[in-house]
């Protein structure tokens, strides 16, 4: 009965500081509500990135001011955090519950490792 | 610092209402789904009720649904419990607690005693 | 429903032991979803483990959580005159949320 997520190990950002991934999630029911959450763990300390609640069927929809967006097809969520430096390197996790009908479910994937190397500035040109 | 203070417990009648507040500082309260869990003098943990985030989505344990109201309003950072029908059976210290974003309860509240006698 | 049976329902034992607590649930529960905690008397429940495994913020190393599918294990390496108290289990990966009946654990 437990709900399964499953997302990549690794993902490498882009120069733009631009990384994208899927989250998959195996549902033990049949949800019409669902919410997804992206947590950033960092020696033990977990904290939100951003999280969307959206109807089967219909777009995921981050707040306007997010650094996330995504697309969900089925079962299947695509998630692609911006605005990305090398700080922000770290784990993220994907969280997915679902919120409607009864009962309600948590599924928490391992964490998609995320590198970010921040874009050598460009030398001045004579 | 993050914490949780219940208030509005009480000695009431069988039938009669209550009504629990749970005051949170120290978080983002909107981002975080909410608990109600009693305790009955002398015995073990009952999860009673929850309210996630926006507060649309509640779910509430067969013992009391029907009967409790969970709501919460974010603008004030707090939670309530709205008990009705009260019977000696929802005697018990009741807890609210937050549930951590991997899900576990990692912050509690000291509790408000609730009796239910005649 | 999971229902939760923690074993034994008093474990008595002297300072400096060790400490293992049983719990079994009902179907399987993913290790995820799976959390003790630590009461003492007149106080709010402590969370000590989540994730079956992993440590809460402040909980000193000699608690221990390990165990999948229905059986898991909380373990106290070296007892200190502070922990003995009232051990519950949950799981947290489906409504309802449920608790164990708890273990206490008391001074020989």
């Known amino acids: 009965k437990a709900m399964h997520v499953a997302q990549p190990a690794v993902v490498l950002a882009s120069s733009r500081g631009i990384a994208s991934f899927v989250c998959e999630y195996a549902s033990p029911g049949k949800a019409t509500e669902v919410r997804v959450t992206v947590l950033r763990q960092a020696d033990s300390q977990v904290t939100e990135v951003c999280a969307a609640t959206y109807m089967m069927g219909n777009e995921l929809t981050f707040l306007d001011d997010s650094i996330c967006t995504g697309t969900s097809s089925g079962n299947q969520v695509n998630l692609t955090i911006q605005g990305l430096r090398a700080m922000d390197t770290g784990l993220y996790i994907c969280k997915v519950e679902l919120m409607y009908p009864p009962p309600y479910y948590l599924g928490i994937g391992n964490g998609t490792q995320i590198y970010v190397i921040d874009p050598e500035p460009c030398p001045d040109s004579d | 610092q993050v914490q949780l203070v219940e208030s509005g417990g009480g000695v009431v009648q069988p039938g009669r209402s209550l009504r629990l507040s749970c005051a949170a500082s120290g978080f983002t309260f909107s981002s975080y789904g909410v608990h109600w869990v009693r305790q009955a003098p002398g015995k073990g943990l009952e999860w009673v009720s929850v309210?996630?985030?926006?507060?649309?989505?509640?779910f509430y344990a067969d013992s009391v649904k029907g009967r409790f109201t969970i709501s919460r309003d974010n603008s004030k950072n707090t939670l309530y419990l709205q008990m009705n029908s009260l019977r000696a059976e929802d005697t018990a210290v009741y807890f609210c607690?937050?549930?951590?974003?991997?899900?576990?309860?990692?912050?509690w509240g000291r509790g408000t005693m609730v009796t239910v006698s005649s | 429903e999971i229902v939760l049976t923690q074993s034994p329902g008093t474990l008595s034992l002297s300072p400096g032991e060790r400490a293992t607590l049983s719990c079994r649930a009902s179907q399987s529960v993913s290790s995820s979803y799976l959390a003790w905690y630590q009461q003492k008397p007149g106080q709010a429940p402590r969370l000590l483990i989540y994730g079956a495994s992993s440590r809460a913020t402040g909980i000193p190393d000699r608690f221990s959580g390990s165990g999948s599918g229905t059986d898991f294990t909380l373990t106290i390496s070296r007892l200190e005159p502070e922990d003995f108290a009232v051990y519950y289990c949950q799981q947290y990966g489906s409504s309802p949320w449920t608790f164990g009946q708890g273990t206490k654990v008391e001074i020989k």
């Open positions: 607690a937050r549930g951590a974003l991997l899900g576990a309860f990692d912050i």
């Open positions: 309210i996630l985030y926006d507060g649309n989505n509640k």
